[in-house]
Interface confidence: low
């Protein structure tokens, strides 16, 4: 029959050229002499001359090595004519499929990938995705199937397996608990992409993972106990500056302190504000204190942050003992 099954030709063939691929044959050759020809891109149109045919035998010839990454499939037409030039067959489709060789290494799309993840996230949390491309075939072969792996992690704290990479998607995820921005703010991972699904050529890139701040540290009073002396009747008088420490990112809502007088100020004599730079709590008198009415106030102040805690954290409380100092007041008649 005047039919040719698709022809598979490996790319980068060594020859010798011309290389016989397949024989075109018309059964009309019993009646008359047949001449064969081919047309189409790769034959009589660009890229011309890649393929040829032995006019009388019908052998299809490959004239040079093929490159699948340039052209993966050629669609030619075979023709059969009699000696007088009359067509004896309908044009026949000839498909030439260029089969892949692993002649390309994977290439990362960037030398350095950057991603970020919140501290304290659970294992399984996705961080970022790296991508390597491989021009080879990944559908019918493993030549272009890239497997990703993490080669090294710096620093190795709290241990050397904080992240994992999905071998086929390149998605980097957290694999261990213990990401703590306050201890390690950034990790550098050396990542590898290896074709042949992990058994072939390897290329390397860097993934930098920034650990983002979460409000996982409560502000803590330091010290927790204060004593202060205030003259009676003084309004707007600075009583005490309360100091807190907070390990979260400075000047962020997770660091900025919010103070609240929880107890001991029944007469609403005091107020507390946050100093914008130092983050200290500035305790001042809202109204004058009366030594004769009460010569000592014990205040309890709680501190939280502007941002909510990302988990339940104990709040820190300070105790301030305020001694009211007597002022010699004019007698009242």
């Amino acid at each position: 029959d005047w039919v040719v099954a698709p022809i598979s030709v490996p790319e980068n063939g060594k020859g010798p050229f011309p290389q016989r691929l397949n024989q075109l044959k018309s059964n009309k050759d019993r009646d008359t002499k047949i001449f064969y020809s081919i047309t189409g891109p790769g034959a009589d149109s660009p890229p011309e001359g890649v393929f040829a045919v032995e006019k009388e035998t019908g052998w299809l010839l490959l004239n040079k090595p093929l490159d699948r990454e340039e052209i993966a499939k050629y669609e030619l037409y075979g023709h059969a004519v009699s000696e007088n030039g009359a067509s004896v067959e309908e044009p026949m489709n000839i498909s030439i499929i260029v089969t892949d060789q692993n002649d390309n290494k994977p290439k990362f799309t960037q030398d350095t990938f950057r991603g970020s993840v919140l501290e304290g996230v659970l294992p399984g949390t996705s961080v970022m995705q790296v991508t390597a491309t491989d021009e080879d075939d990944a559908i019918y072969t493993y030549n272009g199937v890239v497997a990703y792996s993490i080669h090294s992690q710096e620093p190795k704290d709290p241990h050397d397996l904080m992240f994992t990479i999905h071998r086929s998607t390149g998605t980097i995820s957290v694999i261990s608990s213990g990401l703590d921005r306050e201890k390690v703010p950034e990790y550098t991972l050396t990542i590898q992409a290896t074709d042949m699904d992990g058994d072939g050529s390897t290329t390397t890139a860097v993934a930098v993972v920034e650990i983002l701040d979460a409000n996982d540290n409560a502000p803590m009073f330091d010290p927790q106990k204060y004593e202060a002396h205030v003259p009676e009747n003084a309004v707007g008088h600075e009583v005490q500056r309360l100091t807190v420490t907070d390990l979260d990112a400075p000047n962020s809502p997770a660091w900025r302190a919010t103070y609240l007088i929880m107890g001991g100020d029944d007469g609403d004599h005091f107020t507390i504000t946050t100093h914008p730079e130092s983050n200290q709590g500035i305790l001042t008198t809202r109204k004058g204190l009366d030594f004769e009415a009460k010569n000592q106030h014990t205040l309890y102040v709680e501190v939280t942050n502007e941002a909510p805690f990302v988990l339940k954290l104990p709040t820190s409380t300070a105790t301030i003992v305020v001694h009211v100092e007597d002022v010699n007041e004019a007698p009242v008649f």
């Epitope: 919140l118 304290g120 996230v121 983002l212 962020s252 941002a307 909510p308 988990l311």
Partner: antibody
């Protein structure tokens, strides 16, 4: 399937109070925050506050302190919001919405269908 | 209190187009920004949280980006169901605040 089902529409008189509810199912009610959000007709969204049913901890938008009171009943997986001394400004649709305690990074991932409160004499 | 500026306030687009909505904040909120869509008469639906993470079941034509004080939501190849009101929301500091909204209308 996580569901947040709210109580029906309310028509109340000025000066009165109303208590609306939000019943949760399909997730750990006690360990997720329940938020309440106000939406006036044709307007945007306004956060009222939230409650952590596990221990009853609440956080309010200062604007709604004294107006809204948030409570929760763990046994029935139901959160409540009471609105007091109602005026026409309180006429709105009120949504409840869940936040996972940490995993969703404080985004509200499941919302009730909304409860319409109309204040009119 | 944190100020949020969402723009544009409204926009008209056709099915198949790509649109971008932006949200600017008065202070750094890192990546703690969410985007919601609300259709007429319905409750809001979470689309994106932590600036760029797609919520469960949200089509990949939605993408969020940005950090600090500048964020954007991009919708590729608009579908009929994408029309409605879009809100950005700070989910970092109290009070949780929403942008004024963007009304996305069909052209």
């Amino acid at each position: 399937v996580q569901l947040v089902e709210q109580s029906g529409a309310e028509l109340v008189k000025p000066g009165a109070s109303v208590k609306i509810s939000c019943k949760a199912s399909g997730y750990a009610f006690s360990s997720s925050w329940m938020n309440w959000v106000k939406q006036r007709p044709g307007k945007g969204l306004e956060w009222i506050g939230r409650i952590y049913p596990g221990d009853g901890e609440t956080k309010y938008n200062g604007k709604f302190k004294g107006k809204a009171t948030l409570t929760a009943d763990k046994s029935s997986s139901t959160a409540y919001m009471q609105l007091s001394t109602l005026t026409s400004e309180d006429s709105a649709v009120y949504f409840c919405a869940r936040q996972r305690d940490y995993g969703a990074l404080y985004a509200m991932d499941y919302w009730g269908q909304g409860t319409s409160v109309t204040v009119s004499s | 209190e944190l100020q949020m500026t969402q723009s544009p306030a409204s926009l008209s687009a056709s099915v198949g187009e790509t649109v971008t909505i932006t949200c600017r904040l008065s202070e750094n909120i890192y990546s703690y920004l969410a985007w919601y869509r609300q259709k007429e008469g319905e409750s809001p639906q979470l689309l994106v949280y932590n600036s760029k993470t797609l919520a469960e079941g949200v089509p990949s034509r939605f993408s969020g980006s940005g950090s600090g004080t500048q964020f954007s939501l991009k919708i590729n190849s608009l579908q009929p169901e994408d029309f409605g009101n879009y809100y950005c929301q700070n989910h970092y500091g109290f009070p949780f605040t929403f942008g004024a909204g963007t009304k996305l209308e069909i052209k």
